[in-house]
């Protein structure tokens, strides 16, 4: 077991986008027995890196209030890509 903490992170899509990659989904489980969406990569010049709070390995629980549970990977990707200019992420950090 491990401790987790949740945080709301508000990002503004910048010139190089949100600037992170995701893995996971019901059809692409990245963590055993967990179909959640996880951050796999953060681009050094993207909005997420400049904000500084999002970390590789974080689990993203929701985007703009929309729950990411039980989503196909592609549907999760589309949700992020269509999330607009101001993007609110509810994330779970492992401590």
């Amino acid at each position: 077991d491990y401790l987790v903490t949740e945080e709301e992170i508000n990002l503004t899509r910048g010139p190089s986008g949100l600037g992170f990659n995701i893995v996971g989904g019901t059809d692409q489980q990245y963590v055993s027995n967990d179909s959640g969406i996880y951050v796999s990569e953060i681009d050094e010049n993207g909005a997420a890196a400049l904000d500084g709070r999002l970390q590789e390995g974080d689990k993203i629980l929701s985007v703009n209030g929309q729950d990411l549970k039980n989503l196909l990977h592609q549907d999760a990707v589309d949700l992020f890509r269509n999330a607009g200019y101001a993007v609110s992420l509810r994330v779970q950090h492992r401590l």
Epitope: G17, F20, S40, E41, G46, R81
Partner: nanobody
Framework: DVQLVESGGGLVQAGGSLRLSCAAS????????MGWFHQAPGKEREFVAE????????GYADSVKGRFTISRDNAKNTVYLQMNSLKPEDTAVYYC?????????????????????WGQGTQVTVSE
């Protein structure tokens, strides 16, 4: 980590076709977004095309839309770039690249900095 090996380059006349292949080693190939970039002499490496892990998301540079097609075979750990209606300005070294996961941004934002793993490149020369 992933090792990438490109093949299929060569010399072709303008208007001709080539199919590039990129074989990847390592497991969980379907978790990687795969891309192709090209680099002409004296120029920076430029995005050509990319494909998501399940093949659902594809993106292309404006200069190759309608001429190039990217595809992948996850059972063979291979990504392909079918290049049709080739032009002399397509002459370059073509590189295969990989990054774990799917970018949350469309390919309009893509640059070589977004990819972590690279092949050694294969030369494509298009003559007049």
């Amino acid at each position: 980590d992933v090792q990438l090996v490109e093949s299929g380059g060569g010399l072709v006349q303008a208007g001709g076709s080539l199919r590039l292949s990129c074989a990847a080693s390592g497991r969980t190939f379907s978790s990687y977004t795969m891309g192709w970039f090209h680099q002409a002499p004296g120029k920076e490496r430029e995005f050509v095309a990319e494909i998501g892990g399940t093949g659902g998301n594809t993106g292309y540079a404006d200069s190759v839309k309608g001429r190039f097609t990217i595809s992948r075979d996850n059972a063979k750990n291979t990504v392909y770039l079918q290049m049709n209606s080739l032009k002399p300005e397509d002459t370059a070294v073509y590189y295969c690249a990989a990054v774990i996961g799917s970018p949350t941004d469309s390919s309009d934002y893509r640059s070589s900095l977004d990819y972590d793993y690279w092949g050694q490149g294969t030369q494509v020369t298009v003559s007049e």
